[in-house]
């Protein structure tokens, strides 16, 4: 009955502070409406990074001010988080909820440890 969610253990953000990873879920039924939430866990505190609800076959739509973008393909969601800095290094958990049709299912991944390294400032040129 439990819904399994898989995501990579580790991802390294690029020099522009962008990190991408795939969140894949094993759907116990044929969901038509899915909500994907990215959570950040630091110590024992969990906070929401971004969330999107989408209809199967349609694009994910995050809020305009979201730092996340994404695309879906079947039971896979390709997530991209932008604007990351070194202080944002941490565990990012993918949570998937099958909102419709019944029954509701929720699945939580084990988390992706995203490492962010701030770029070195360019040396002044004479």
């Amino acid at each position: 009955k439990a819904m399994h969610v898989a995501q990579p253990a580790v991802v390294l953000a690029n020099s522009r502070g962008t990190a991408s990873f795939v969140c894949e879920y094993a759907s116990p039924g044929k969901a038509t409406e899915v909500r994907v939430t990215v959570l950040r866990q630091a110590d024992s505190q969990v906070t929401e990074v971004c969330a999107a609800t989408y209809m199967m076959g349609n694009e994910l739509t995050f809020l305009d001010d979201s730092i996340c973008t994404g695309t879906s393909s079947g039971n896979q969601v390709n997530l991209t988080i932008q604007g990351l800095r070194a202080m944002d290094t941490g565990l990012y958990i993918c949570k998937v909820e099958l909102m419709y049709p019944p029954p509701y299912y929720m699945g939580i991944g084990n988390g992706t440890q995203i490492y962010v390294i701030d770029p070195e400032p360019c040396p002044d040129s004479d």
Partner: antibody, heavy 118, light 108 residues
């Protein structure tokens, strides 16, 4: 701090209606799914109904399906439970509860007592 | 529907003793989706453990959870006077959300 405050309970005759409210504060209400859970006198906890973030998706226990309606007003940070065709077996303390980020019910209201009696 | 069965119904112990409460599911529950709650008379339930073994904010470390699949356990290592209460397990991975019938931990 997170607070959930239920109201609207009372004594009502069988077959009549009642509407419960749950006022939420201390968090961004629209970012959380919500539930109603009830507890009959001296008994255990029984999940009653669930509502999604925007109120679009709702789920009900078989015991209340077709009689109870859950709704929410995100602009007022308030959760509602409309209870129609009440029965004696609906007598209980009704709690509203917030779904935590990882799924458990992390905050509960203090409860409101509904007594269905003639 | 996942049915949760708790045992024993009542546990009579003295302060300082160890309490072991069991919760058995009728079908597999992912460990990420099992919680324990404490309820004292006249109060709302309080979340103790989620994800089978993670303590909720502010919960003392004498409370611990374990288990997977269909068998889960809540352990209170040394009972304090304020721990005498009713404890419920719950699964929250799929609808309908279900609770066990509760275990009452009473003073012997």
């Amino acid at each position: 701090q997170v607070q959930l405050v239920e109201s609207g309970g009372g004594v009502v005759q069988p077959g009549r209606s009642l509407r419960l409210s749950c006022a939420a504060s201390g968090f961004t209400f629209s970012h959380y799914t919500m539930h109603w859970v009830r507890q009959a006198p001296g008994k255990g906890l029984e999940w009653v109904t669930f509502i999604s973030y925007d109120g679009h998706n709702k789920y009900y226990a078989d015991s209340v399906k077709g009689r109870f309606t859950i709704s929410r007003d995100n602009s007022k940070n308030t959760l509602y439970l409309q209870m129609n065709s009440l029965r004696a077996e609906d007598t209980a303390i009704y709690y509203c509860a917030r779904t935590g980020w990882l799924g458990p019910f992390d905050y509960w209201g203090q409860g409101t007592l509904v007594t269905v009696s003639s | 529907e996942i049915v949760l069965t708790q045992s024993p119904g009542t546990l009579s112990l003295s302060p300082g003793e160890r309490a072991t409460l069991s919760c058995r599911a009728s079908q597999e529950v992912g460990e990420s989706y099992l919680a324990w709650y404490q309820q004292k008379p006249g109060q709302a339930p309080r979340l103790l453990i989620y994800g089978a073994f993670s303590r909720a904010t502010g919960i003392p470390d004498r409370f611990s959870g374990s288990g997977s699949g269909t068998d889960f356990t809540l352990t209170i290592s040394r009972l304090e006077p304020e721990d005498f209460a009713v404890y419920y397990c719950q699964q929250y991975g799929s609808s309908p959300w279900t609770f066990g019938q509760g275990t009452k931990v009473e003073i012997k």
